[in-house]
Interface confidence: low
């Protein structure tokens, strides 16, 4: 907390500029008008303030806006955002995607902090759903963002937003999350032709039921083993040897290397040995 002291003669700030970096903390407190700071926030980032000086500037804004900063100020916080606590951010009403992008840019390259998590939470709740533009933005900054949402939260993602999802965005999703996302993806991509559809739906197949895998096996999709290994065990078990052979195409030989791992191991145990022998891979049921 900075003591209230009178501003020395001639030091009253007329604008936010480089001269302020030479002000002591108490001088910043006494000589910088909070309203001036709020209107010239965009200049703060161009000035090499110390973290201690930024603390004073934050304190001034907190006094000016005890109920939370307006978006016009938030959008230009820049590095001052790193000084905000989740409690500060919970008071904000952020509605502009440009504001969100500006603040995510400040934190770029860092782990998702509690501050960023709170900011995203406020923004998404304010919008009511994860629309495509928001999802595009969030996954660009945090590829794992989608998989950090609970299945309940994912259920509010509209199918149209699925177009923004890249395969790497789903790398860390667990089966229950894919269970929610898969039907949305199927809906989103339903008008695509066979080969294009498979390219798009492939990353979501960890949530696919048996009947969809059976349908895919009729499409000459040549699923790779990495995708097959991510399928739900309960969805793979009912597939026949012929269906798995059609589903994998030339990749069927890869089953041998994975015979001790789920879901391949469990699937093998469900098959008749005669059927397995038709693959010529030496798989033992």
């Amino acid at each position: 907390e900075v003591e209230k002291t009178a501003c020395p003669s001639g030091k009253k700030a007329r604008e936010i500029d480089e001269s302020l970096i030479f002000y002591k903390k108490w001088e910043l407190e006494a000589c910088v008008d909070a309203a001036l700071l709020a209107t010239q926030m965009d200049r703060v980032n161009a000035i090499p303030f110390t973290y201690e000086q930024l603390d004073v500037l934050k304190h001034k804004l907190d006094e000016l806006y005890p109920q939370g900063y307006p978006e016009s100020v938030i959008q230009h916080l820049g590095y001052l955002f790193l000084k905000m606590s989740p409690e500060d951010i919970r008071k904000w009403n952020v509605t502009s995607l440009e504001t969100l992008k500006a603040l995510l840019e400040v934190n770029k390259g860092h782990e998702m902090s509690p501050q960023v998590a709170t900011l995203i939470d406020r923004f998404v709740k304010g919008r009511g759903q994860l629309d495509k533009d928001t999802l595009d933005t969030l996954t660009a900054f945090y590829p794992g963002y989608l998989c950090s949402l609970s299945p309940e939260e994912l259920s509010s993602v509209p199918p149209s937003s699925i177009w923004a999802v890249r395969p790497q965005d789903l790398d860390t999703c667990d089966p229950r999350q894919l269970d929610v996302l898969y039907p949305k993806a199927r809906l989103a991509f339903q008008n695509m032709n066979g080969s294009e559809y498979f390219v798009k739906i492939q990353s979501f197949l960890g949530g696919a039921p048996t009947e969809d895998l059976k349908a895919l096996s009729q499409q000459n999709v040549s699923m790779d083993l990495a995708t097959f290994m991510k399928l739900r065990t309960d969805a793979v078990l009912p597939l026949t040897v012929a269906e798995v052979q059609k589903l994998l195409g030339p990749h069927v030989e890869g089953l041998k290397a994975e015979e001790r791992h789920r879901p391949v191991r469990d699937w093998i145990l469900r098959q008749r040995q005669d059927d397995l022998d038709t693959l010529g891979l030496g798989l033992q049921g």
Epitope: M112, Y145, C147, S148, D174, Q177
Partner: nanobody, 120 residues
Framework: QVQLVESGGGSVQAGGSLRLSCAAS????????MGWFRQAPGKERERVAQ???????TYADSVKGRFTIARDDAENTLYLQMNSLKPEDTAMYSC??????????????WGQGTQVTVSS
């Protein structure tokens, strides 16, 4: 429905040990990030330790070297081994589970908590 049930709390003398457990249902402990928080009467909730999906662990400075967080994937349970306990460790300890790689704050799911009391 996700449920987290803590156990293992109790009263202990300073210097003693306790092992807290958090049994999860409807949630796979290896699928996301999990953590332990504590709250003493009249104090704010404090993050004690957390373990990421990749099993990376982090601790509050006040418990480093004394507490160990671990999970047992087979038992689907999170643990907090607390050694060299001090009176200031007295609090209600709650486990929390997050979805995904980010330990978003606050936790997505909370247990009811288990009381730990350390007397001098």
């Amino acid at each position: 429905q996700v449920q987290l049930v803590e156990s293992g709390g109790g009263s202990v003398q300073a210097g003693g040990s306790l092992r807290l457990s958090c049994a999860a249902s409807g949630y796979t402990v290896s699928s996301g990030c999990m953590g332990w928080f504590r709250q003493a009467p009249g104090k704010e909730r404090e993050r004690v330790a957390q373990i990421g999906r990749d099993a990376t662990t982090t601790y509050a400075d006040s418990v480093k070297g004394r507490f160990t967080i671990a999970r047992d994937d087979a038992e689907n349970t999170l643990y907090l081994q607390m050694n060299s306990l001090k009176p200031e460790d007295t609090a209600m300890y709650s486990c929390t589970a997050y979805w995904g790689v980010y330990c978003l704050s606050p936790g997505r799911y909370w247990g009811q908590g288990t009381q730990v009391t350390v007397s001098s």
